[in-house]
Every structure is written in structure tokens, then in C-alpha cells.
């Protein structure tokens, strides 16, 4: 058993049929010595008396808020949560496996630039009685500070019969140099509590590996005289690291119709303009990627050919 | 430690071309190592990230873009800093700043070159003959060093009398290649920045 936060404790249980469970001793936080009784949750049934209460925790029915009273007055609470371990593996029931970029990916993180700011998100089908708390650091043995905000519900989607909820959190490394060469990864830890179930999820990454620039901005078209060719120009996204001559981007320019199966014109360039062939009912799209370290491409910025 | 005196090419920038070739070569070599050594811990997640130039050169700091010199977090680890106060860069000769930066890059390349050559000598003794360093990568390191045009004492190649542990050597190769790729990215950024300046 360990303390998650004040008056909240996590009991780690090997979860299999007829498991013996864990013996837990609760102590009432009071100077009083006698006349103390214990109850669980909303029940008025007295579970025991005395300053301490010893219980055998085997299942979720044994978890919950234990309260010690004296003469109708509440003295203190202890909330017991369960953390299940099945076949030596901690349970991952609360969050959905996003399977990208590999299986068992519960947390996904992205950074728009090298400033040390990043966003992580996760998915769940659970809608109520759900809380998250996020901690982060650079390295684990001698951790350096990363400050994370509160996790918030950022999107809701319908997937078949199920509703899916996306939560996200923003974090900022306390003293980040955009030009630094990372040797220690960022560690992100998410504590998830659903009703009386506790789970924790972690992710470890270098900022350089989670870079995904915003799409290029200010796309403009200039038809070339006596030609089907069009000069398309754009600018670096505002959120990208500066100076741009140091943090350079490379671009992919594509002309395509509405369907992905349609024919297309595609060209890669390090410049902020390109000449392509425009077709009726097609659109020109441009996306960006770090020129020197190939992490993710940005989403497309698009303008219609016409 | 006295850094060698630079005679940077005024047009800078055959260096840009060579640095692009360097990044390409080390990225290809790393990819080849990952594929060939698939049963060794050779991915970014599996290896320890070591920097053989740590405390010996200060390329990131010495080559910091002017725009980032106002960022306290970028300055706190400077050892061979040419900046003595927050805004005095303008008062120093840009050529001095560039010389310091380029000499630091040269020193990096020299150190990696020695490590890679020593390692290749060991790998050539491996009866499995599983992996060797790409001669193109070694040639590209050499070309960039020549383009940087520095004079500095040659570092003797390390020779080792004990029987090489090929498993450890291959793990070390992965560690070196990962670190060198990151440094090659920095070098490419620096060359691009200097070229634009």
C-alpha cells in the first residue's frame, strides 16, 4: 500500500481467482484513543472499533472511503483504491490502446517546436467518475523540472456504438534551450482513477522525436503565363522555432482531387515556393517537416486550384 | 585548452554541402546498423545516450544562433563561451565567434573519426563479419574536416591489446552512431544558419 495523495491510498493486488489479497491497517487521524468506530462509504454498518482497523482487501467491494467517527462526529477519512496486477502485468482498463506508432501506446505526445512545450493526449470510453493527474520530468534518476497543467476533456467522438473521450494536457520544460541536444528523455506519468480503480501510464520520449510542425501558413497561388503551371508560395508556421535558417523546414507540395486514389502532382522542396500543375476541381496542399531530423510531417494546408 | 585558429572559407559554403552529406551518411549508416543488428539493443529507446565530446567540445554553445543567446537556458552550460555579458555579442568580431564554432565542429569530427576508425579495426576482426563502418561515412567526415580547413595536432588512433568483445563493440557502435547523428543534425543546422548569415 502507498499514499497517492493526502488520505488516498493505493492497494496493489495480484488479481486472480481466490487470491489472498492484502492485509491493510488503517489508523484514525485523531488524538482520541477510545470510542472510535469505522464505516465504509455511505453504509452505517460499523466495521470495527478502536484507533486502528485491520481489513483484508481482495476485491473492489473492500475498497472505498473508510471513515472513523466518535459520537456521530467524523474524525478522518482514508480512501482505498485498487491497482490490479494480472499475470505480472498492471491493468490498463481505463485508457484505450491507440496502437500508434506501436501496440500498447496509451499516451501520445507531440511538440510544435523545440521550445520544450508539448501536448500529450489519451483516449477512454469512460464518461464519469474519472480523474487524471499528470507529472513529468526530464530524466528519472536526477529529474529536471517539467510543469504540466491539468488534464482536460479535449474531444468527444462517436465510434460505432461507443462514445470515445479524448483528454489532453500541456506541459512545459522549465528551462529548455531549443538548440540543445537531448541526452535524457522526457518522462510523462499519468495517474488515472476510475471509481475505485487506480492505474498509471507512462511515456518516455525526446522532444526531437515528437516534433510535428503546424501546417505552413499563407498559401498563395500565382498562375504562370501561357502555362498550366502555377507558382504556389507559403510561409513558415508562426509556432515554428526561430531562427528559421537554423531550424529549417522541408516541404511537400501536392496537387490532388478530392479522392486519394486520384492522380496527383507531387514535389518536395526546401524553399517556400514551388511550381506545380493545377487541375480543375483539384486543390494544392503543402505540409512541412523538420529538414534535418525526420520526425512527423505537419497536417496539410490547402487551397483550391481554381 | 587552446582551440585551433580558424581560417574559415570566406564563401563558407562548400561546408554546407559537406555537412548535408555527413548527415545523410550517418543516417544511412545508423539505419544499416539498426537493420543488421536487429537482435542487439540498437534503437533510440534501447541505448544509453552518451556524448563522447561532452566536456571536451562545446559545439551547441559555441555555435548558438545569435537569436538564442538571449535565452538563459541556452547559456547556462557554456564553458568556452565567447559571450561575457547578455548583449555584448555585437561588440565581438563575428569572425571570432564563427572560428570558435567551426573549430569546435572540427574537434567533434576528429574525435568521432578516431572512435570510428578504432571501432572499425575491431569489427574487421569479428569472425561473423556482421557489420563494418561505411567507408563513405568516413570519407565524408574527412571531406568536411578538410573543408573546415583547420590545423590541429592529430590524435593517435587508439590501439587495444586485449581481445575485443564484439558484442560490446556493436553496442558501442550503435551508441556512437546515435550520438553522431544528433551532432550531425546540429552541424547541419549551424552550417545552414551561417550560410544564410
Amino acid at each position: 500500500i502507498w499514499e497517492l495523495k493526502k488520505d488516498v491510498y493505493v492497494v496493489e493486488l495480484d488479481w486472480y481467482p481466490d487470491a489472498p489479497g492484502e492485509m491493510v491497517v488503517l489508523t484514525c487521524d485523531t488524538p482520541e484513543e477510545d470510542g472510535i468506530t469505522w464505516t465504509l462509504d455511505q453504509s452505517s454498518e460499523v466495521l470495527g472499533s478502536g484507533k486502528t482497523l485491520t481489513i483484508q482487501v481482495k476485491e473492489f467491494g473492500d475498497a472505498g472511503q473508510y471513515t472513523c467517527h466518535k459520537g456521530g462526529e467524523v474524525l478522518s477519512h482514508s480512501l482505498l483504491l485498487l491497482h490490479k496486477k494480472e499475470d505480472g502485468i498492471w491493468s490498463t482498463d481505463i485508457l484505450k490502446d491507440q496502437k500508434e506508432p506501436k501496440n500498447k501506446t496509451f499516451l501520445r505526445c507531440e511538440a510544435k517546436n523545440y521550445s520544450g512545450r508539448f501536448t500529450c493526449w489519451w483516449l477512454t470510453t469512460i464518461s464519469t467518475d474519472l480523474t487524471f493527474s499528470v507529472k513529468s520530468s526530464r530524466g528519472s534518476s536526477d529529474p529536471q523540472g517539467v510543469t504540466c497543467g491539468a488534464a482536460t476533456l479535449s474531444a468527444e467522438r462517436v465510434r460505432g456504438d461507443n462514445k470515445e473521450y479524448e483528454y489532453s494536457v500541456e506541459c512545459q520544460e522549465d528551462s529548455a534551450c531549443p538548440a540543445a541536444e537531448e541526452s535524457l528523455p522526457i518522462e510523462v506519468m499519468v495517474d488515472a482513477v476510475h471509481k475505485l480503480k487506480y492505474e498509471n501510464y507512462t511515456s518516455s520520449f525526446f522532444i526531437r522525436d515528437i516534433i510535428k510542425p503546424d501546417p505552413p501558413k499563407n498559401l498563395q497561388l500565382k498562375p504562370l503565363k501561357n502555362s498550366r503551371q502555377v507558382e504556389v508560395s507559403w510561409e513558415y508556421p508562426d509556432t515554428w522555432s526561430t531562427p528559421h535558417s537554423y531550424f529549417s523546414l522541408t516541404f511537400c507540395v501536392q496537387v490532388q482531387g478530392k479522392s486519394k486514389r486520384e492522380k496527383k502532382d507531387r514535389v518536395f522542396t526546401d524553399k517556400t515556393s514551388a511550381t506545380v500543375i493545377c487541375r480543375k476541381n483539384a486543390s494544392i496542399s503543402v505540409r512541412a517537416q523538420d529538414r534535418y531530423y525526420s520526425s512527423s510531417w505537419s497536417e496539410w494546408a490547402s487551397v483550391p486550384c481554381s | 585548452r587552446n582551440l585551433p585558429v580558424a581560417t574559415p572559407d570566406p564563401g563558407m559554403f562548400p561546408c554546407l554541402h559537406h555537412s548535408q552529406n555527413l548527415l545523410r551518411a550517418v543516417s544511412n549508416m545508423l539505419q544499416k546498423a539498426r537493420q543488421t543488428l536487429e537482435f542487439y539493443p540498437c534503437t533510440s529507446e534501447e541505448i544509453d545516450h552518451e556524448d563522447i565530446t561532452k566536456d571536451k567540445t562545446s559545439t551547441v554553445e559555441a555555435c548558438l544562433p545569435l537569436e538564442l543567446t538571449k535565452n538563459e537556458s541556452c547559456l547556462n552550460s557554456r564553458e568556452t563561451s565567447f559571450i561575457t555579458n547578455g548583449s555584448c555579442l555585437a561588440s565581438r568580431k563575428t569572425s571570432f565567434m564563427m572560428a570558435l564554432c567551426l573549430s569546435s565542429i572540427y574537434e567533434d569530427l576528429k574525435m568521432y573519426q578516431v572512435e570510428f576508425k578504432t571501432m572499425n579495426a575491431k569489427l574487421l576482426m569479428d569472425p561473423k563479419r556482421q557489420i563494418f563502418l561505411d567507408q563513405n561515412m568516413l570519407a565524408v567526415i574527412d571531406e568536411l574536416m578538410q573543408a573546415l580547413n583547420f590545423n590541429s595536432e592529430t590524435v593517435p588512433q587508439k590501439s587495444s591489446l586485449e581481445e575485443p568483445d564484439f558484442y560490446k563493440t556493436k553496442i558501442k557502435l550503435c551508441i556512437l552512431l546515435h550520438a553522431f547523428r544528433i551532432r550531425a543534425v546540429t552541424i547541419d543546422r549551424v552550417m545552414s544558419y551561417l550560410n544564410a548569415s
Partner: antibody
Amino acid sequence: QVQLVQSGAEVKKPGSSVKVSCKASGGTFSDYYLHWSRQAPGQGLEWMGWIDPENGDTEYAPKFQGRVTITADESTSTAYMELSSLRSEDTAVYYCARNKELRYIDVWGQGTLVTVSS
Amino acid sequence: DIVMTQSPLSLPVTPGEPASISCRASQSISINLHWYQQKPGQQPRLLIAFASQSISGVPSRFSGSGSGTDFTLTISSLQPEDFATYYCQQSNSFPLTFGQGTKVEIK
């Protein structure tokens, strides 16, 4: 299976024209760009131009501008390349080729040898 | 027009050995570079698109690298069926242009 079948070999006199055909099968004809390239005996490849069969748009290499005409007939899934004012140095194997990507080629025809000789 | 220069023009290789062909552009073309293989009396065959993207059906021993002006096609271990002429082609701008070809022959 996408296939491009070209017309047979031709022998032409200098100053005349030649029209080579290229019939496509497999896939929708207008879903692809069609290119024409040529290869002189023992020489490398030379790109001549492309056509978008959907709208008839064409682009020619400056070297052939004014001498080459590429057309397409959607009803028969056939593309044509006509080269006029032939000279001996136009002796080559002419290839039609196609791709959904405009700027490179993933399927080539078998080639048509055009010999220009007096 | 962008001029593509291949080297060497002839490359004698022992079967089972690796081979590398270089292609240089007269100006920077990013990764707009494609590789083809052509055997005598046959039409060309696409091997690699956009400098390094593998094409389905092409053996994994063929790989491409490079960007800007310098590109390389590598065959990790030459098989008897790989003896052919190889062409690079730029698609950075029209007109599309090819290298003059590299003939890989048996040593």
C-alpha cells in the same frame, strides 16, 4: 494488371511525320498521366512530354516543342504521339508510359522503334 | 534544364558483392529523384521513387539515399538478374531529365 501496348515499328523518310499509338488496359484510362519518352540506339532515356487524358492538358519538353503533339482518345483508351519534321537523329525506340503521379513513371509500354532513313 | 550526371558510366561487379551508383544534379532538387533499371531489349522498370522510397515488388536489396544534389542507388548484394543499366531521373522541374545511365556488368 495495368498494360500499355504500343503500335509496331515504323520506317520513315526525313521530313515526314510519324504517329505512334499506345493502348492502355487495366484501370481507368483517365485516372493516369501518360508520358512519352524515347531512347536512341545505345543511348540514354529522353523525356518528351505528358498528357492528362481527362482534360487533354499537355506539357512538352522545350526540345520537342512545336514538333511533337500528344493526344488521347478516352473512348478507346489510346494515347498518340506524333512527331513531325523527322530527321535521322530521331531514330529511336519511343516509349509510352503512365502513372498516377505526374513526375515519374511506374508502367512502361514495350516501345516502338522508329527508324528515320532516306 | 536540370542536368543529371551519373557515375561511373560502367561498373564491373562480382555477383554477391554490393554496388553503388552515384547521380548528381546540376542544382538542388531536394528528394525529387527516381531510379530505373533497364535490361537490354526491355522497357525501363521503376526501382525507387523520391530518392529513398521503395516500390512494391522491388527486392529489398535495392535502396536509395540522398537529397539536394547528391544521390546514391545501392544494391546490397548483386544477383545475376541485376546486371543491367540504371538511370536516375529528376522530377524537380519540367522538363523531366534522366542521367546518362550506368551499366552494371559482371566482373
